[in-house]
Interface confidence: medium
């Protein structure tokens, strides 16, 4: 069964993915891609990595955690209705059937709050963002307002603090972090 | 205000390397993912990369694959674009542009540019 | 990668005039599409990104459209400054591609 992540619309969807690397920048391979996890490969990629670097992405598809050390965690930026869906994270470790999988559900509500109309000014959109986490039961959403000053990075950083304070455990505990080598 | 300041001109012989440098000022650093772009003597724009400032990751045009890093050092809020095995089709003026994220590579800012030259 | 092309590659026109640059993508790229305007020896700026949404600062005779595959900017009463060259660029999978260019004479 699918763990399931909500997101509103118009705000940052977060799906957590981590496998701890062999060694430091001994990198594995890894894809998103929108739809369950085939036997193969990722269907759909939005995203795919190399035993380097980010080597193809899609619009509005990022990395924004440490992959070097294994967070491997997509980002969704201003998430539609039609981002609902399943999302596979593939870690492609070498060998026959190595590959581990992780089929994350993700669930879009139309936006509670019609923001007031922003001045336009430029095209780092006054979105409200939004943090998905899972805790204990129900997905937990945490939105942080509008704040038109924050952006991914930061929004990152908070996620980052967020998982290494509560959602950690809760990953690792279920299954959803991997260890290599 | 936001600025990106770039290195001076080079002048590099084939087979060489040169290492430009984008210095960012007037933003969070580490809030915008950097991107550079070449453009050769009367030609069109031509993506090379982008790099993420806060956790380093990066990618790279299919082009440029193995010639190409990018780096940062967020002491100093500058990003570096080095390219490798330089060729005379090198010679362009090669800038950084900044984008708030990636809905997705549009860049609202961009350097000055720095004009690299290779020729024996 | 996605292909850009644009059309005309040159073209001469005069203060005042309405003028229509198009920009067709290889495949369909929804709205993500962005407009530059580049000066002789100095760098690109943004005018217009996603297709139609106008960049802070820019005056409002410029306006773009389209969708899928092609897009336009039009420039309503050209002004000397806009005597220029203007690019195209698709966002929407990488790598991010540009047109080859459209330059604005003085006619």
């Known amino acids: 069964s699918e763990v399931e992540y909500r997101a509103e619309v118009g705000q940052n969807a977060y799906l957590p993915c981590f496998y701890t690397p062999a060694a430091p920048g001994n990198l594995v391979p890894v894809c998103w891609g929108k739809g369950a996890c085939p036997v193969f490969e990722c269907g759909n990629v939005v995203l795919r990595t190399d035993e380097r670097d980010v080597n193809y992405w899609t619009s509005r598809y990022w990395l924004n955690g440490d992959f070097r050390k294994g967070d491997v965690s997509l980002t969704i930026e201003n998430v539609t209705l039609a981002d609902s869906g399943i999302y596979c994270c593939r870690i492609q470790i070498p060998g026959i059937m190595n590959d581990e999988k992780f089929n994350l559900k993700l669930v879009i509500k139309p936006a509670k709050v019609t923001p007031a109309p922003t001045r336009q000014r430029d095209f780092t959109a006054a979105f409200p963002r939004m943090l998905t986490t899972r805790g204990h039961g129900p997905a937990e959403t945490q939105t942080l307002g509008s704040l038109p000053d924050i952006n991914l990075t930061q929004i990152s950083t908070l996620a980052n603090e967020l998982r290494d304070s509560r959602l950690a455990n809760d990953l690792r505990d279920s299954g959803a972090t991997i260890r290599i080598g | 205000q936001v600025q990106l300041v770039q290195s001076g001109a080079e002048v590099k012989k084939p087979g060489a390397s040169v290492k430009v440098s984008c210095k960012a000022s007037?933003?969070?650093?580490?809030?915008?993912?950097m991107h550079w772009v070449r453009q050769a003597p009367g030609q069109g724009l031509e993506w090379m990369g982008i790099?993420?400032?806060?956790?380093?990751?990066?990618s790279y045009a299919q082009k440029f694959q193995g010639r190409v890093t990018m780096t940062r050092d967020t002491s100093t809020s500058t990003v570096y674009m080095e390219l490798s095995s330089l060729r005379s089709e090198d010679t362009a003026v090669y800038y950084c542009?900044?984008?708030?994220?990636?809905?997705?590579?549009?860049?609202?800012?961009w350097g000055q540019g720095t004009l690299v030259t290779v020729s024996s | 990668d996605i292909q850009m092309t644009q059309s005309p590659s040159f073209m001469s026109a005069s203060v005042g005039d309405r003028v229509t640059i198009t920009c067709r993508a290889s495949q369909d790229i929804g709205s993500y599409l962005a407009w530059y305007q580049q000066k002789p020896g100095k760098a690109p700026k943004l005018l217009i990104y996603?297709?139609?949404t106008l960049q802070s600062g820019v005056p409002s005779r410029f306006s773009g459209s389209g969708s899928g595959t092609d897009f336009t900017l039009t420039i309503n009463s050209l002004q000397p400054e806009d005597f220029a060259t203007y690019y195209c660029q698709q966002s929407y999978s990488s790598p991010p591609t540009f047109g080859p260019g459209t330059t604005l004479e003085i006619k």
């Open positions: 790099i993420n400032p806060s956790g380093g990751s990066t």
């Open positions: 996603a297709a139609s």
């Open positions: 542009a900044r984008s708030p994220g990636v809905v997705t590579a549009l860049f609202d800012y």
């Open positions: 007037g933003y969070t650093f580490t809030s915008y993912y």
